[in-house]
Interface confidence: medium
């Protein structure tokens, strides 16, 4: 189920695009293997922009959170709402856009790294372990701050990008979050769009490096949604 996802507080306060969908919108890449979106299949497109009903933040896109559309509205009717930018009011981390977190009711930049080593991250495995099947289960994992005295090298476990050495960012990769290289020109990237995919981001890529942006590969314009590739290209 989609309840078995990374705790939104742990993932949405990361630098972009780490709170984001790792696959290309509309492709199976954005969902956990074998896990379907609620009320739809994992190949659904994201071109329909109607409000997306939700029960939890995890069911919303990278730049959204789940809440009642009206203040003090019916708690039973919740939809995915646009995330709050820096200095906007918030009640929890998930309300703030990627790269920010909620501090004293205001969205502030997570670059300040106030709570290094203090976050208890909920890593929920959606791939059955030795005692279960694909139904998934929840498990609390506290990553000790002792692990982060030295900057993480490529492939080492991390909580956030500041745990990683220069040129690396902290991104989820299948079972854990690890330090991955910031993307170079021509490398495959993930295009984040409004109303992003509503699934478990089981893989994440770093963002494109300085002077680059993530755009659709020229020869893939005709490709179907599920196979189209985006690459880092010069502005």
């Amino acid at each position: 189920t989609l309840n078995s996802v990374l705790n939104s507080n742990a993932i949405k306060n990361l630098p972009p695009p780490l709170g984001g969908a790792a696959g290309h919108p509309g492709s199976a890449v954005s969902a956990a293997p074998g896990i379907l979106y609620p009320g739809g299949n994992k190949y659904q497109t994201i071109d329909n922009y109607q409000p997306y009903p939700c029960a939890e933040d995890e069911e919303c896109g990278t730049d959204e959170y789940c809440a009642s559309p009206t203040r003090g509205g019916d708690a039973g009717v919740q939809i995915c709402l646009a995330c709050r930018k820096r200095r906007k009011r918030c009640m929890r981390h998930a309300m703030c856009c990627p790269g920010n977190y909620c501090k004293n009711g205001i969205c502030v930049s997570s670059d300040q790294n106030h709570f290094r080593g203090e976050i208890e991250e909920t890593i929920t495995e959606s791939f059955g372990n030795d005692h279960s099947t694909l139904d998934g289960y929840s498990r609390r994992t506290t990553l000790s701050s002792k692990m982060y005295h030295t900057k993480g090298q490529e492939g080492s476990v991390c909580l956030r990008s500041s745990d990683c050495a220069s040129g690396l960012c902290c991104a989820r990769h299948f079972w854990s979050k690890i330090c991955k290289p910031v993307l170079k020109e021509g490398q495959v990237c993930t295009k984040h769009r409004r109303k992003g995919s509503h699934g478990l981001e089981i893989f994440q890529r770093c963002y494109c490096g300085e002077g680059l942006s993530c755009r659709i590969q020229k020869d893939h314009h005709q490709a179907s949604n599920s196979s189209r590739l985006h690459t880092c290209q010069r502005h």
Epitope: G23, H24, S27, A28, V29, P33, G34, K42, Y43, E125, F127, N129, D130, L134, R139, T141, M147, T150, G152, Q153, E154, G155, S156, V157, H173, F174, W175, S176, I178, K180, G186, Q187, V188, F203, R205, S226, S227, L229
Partner: antibody, heavy 118, light 111 residues
Framework: QVQLVESGGGLVQPGGSLRLSCAAS????????MSWVRQAPGKGLEWVSV??????????YYAASVKGRFTISRDNSKNTLYLQMNSLRAEDTAVYYC?????????WGQGTLVTVSS | DIALTQPASVSGSPGQSITISCTGT?????????VSWYQQHPGKAPKLMIY???NRPSGVSNRFSGSKSGNTASLTISGLQAEDEADYYC???????????FGGGTKLTVL
């Protein structure tokens, strides 16, 4: 530099047991997920199992072909990964590689041969 | 069971370019833009050459490149050299019980 050295392979009869070890050095072992991948003689690679970076209560995953028979474990204080193999079958005959699961299998050991035969 | 299909062998002359294909389904390679390629010389351990479709780990020659379209991924080796002669395996992630899938391998012969 990163080094992974497997040991514990050998000849065992069907139904028997064997415990493989993988000694890791050159990196912070406790910060990485670790996997076992095997390769039957003259055949391709087959993923066997993976364990998370924590040593106590670490989440583990297994390929369907070995689930219930093999157990992966690790001792971070000794920088060592283990694979306990029970109820061995002829089809388990292979070179078993220990691999660091960073960005995919980014470092491999040289492998240890397990032969299951009567 | 081999989940990803590769040609059993390919060959090329020094200096030439060759491409090795790897075909899967929408449940594995086609559904995830996360394809890796490994090189394995006889009697040696595999070595990661490409990850995330077209990313090279540090230390891997830029003669090696990866791409993907639909359910098929490709590894291209340009300026073929004698030391490139080896077996090459593709790897992807998959839905279902098998989380990691490999191709059957392709033997590259440098003529």
């Amino acid at each position: 530099q990163v080094q992974l050295v497997e040991s514990g392979g050998g000849l065992v009869q069907p139904g028997g047991s064997l415990r493989l070890s993988c000694a890791a050095s050159g990196f912070t072992f406790s910060s990485y997920w670790m996997s076992w991948v095997r390769q039957a003689p003259g055949k391709g690679l087959e993923w066997v199992s993976v364990i998370e970076h924590k040593d106590k209560g670490g989440t583990t995953y297994y390929a369907a072909s070995v689930k219930g028979r093999f157990t992966i474990s690790r001792d971070n204080s000794k920088n060592t990964l283990y694979l306990q193999m029970n109820s061995l079958r002829a089809e388990d005959t292979a070179v078993y590689y220990c691999a660091r699961h960073g960005i995919d299998f980014d470092h491999w050991g040289q492998g240890t041969l397990v032969t299951v035969s009567s | 069971d081999i989940a990803l299909t590769q040609p059993a062998s390919v060959s090329g002359s020094p200096g030439q370019s060759i491409t090795i294909s790897c075909t899967g389904t929408s449940s594995d390679l086609g559904g995830y833009n996360y394809v890796s390629w490994y090189q394995q010389h006889p009697g040696k351990a595999p070595k990661l050459m490409i990850y995330d479709v077209n990313n090279r780990p540090s230390g891997v020659s830029n003669r090696f490149s990866g791409s993907k379209s639909g359910n098929t991924a490709s590894l291209t080796i340009s300026g073929l050299q004698a030391e490139d002669e080896a077996d090459y395996y593709c790897q992807s992630y998959a839905s279902g019980n098998t989380k990691v899938v490999f191709g059957g391998g392709t033997k590259l012969t440098v003529l």
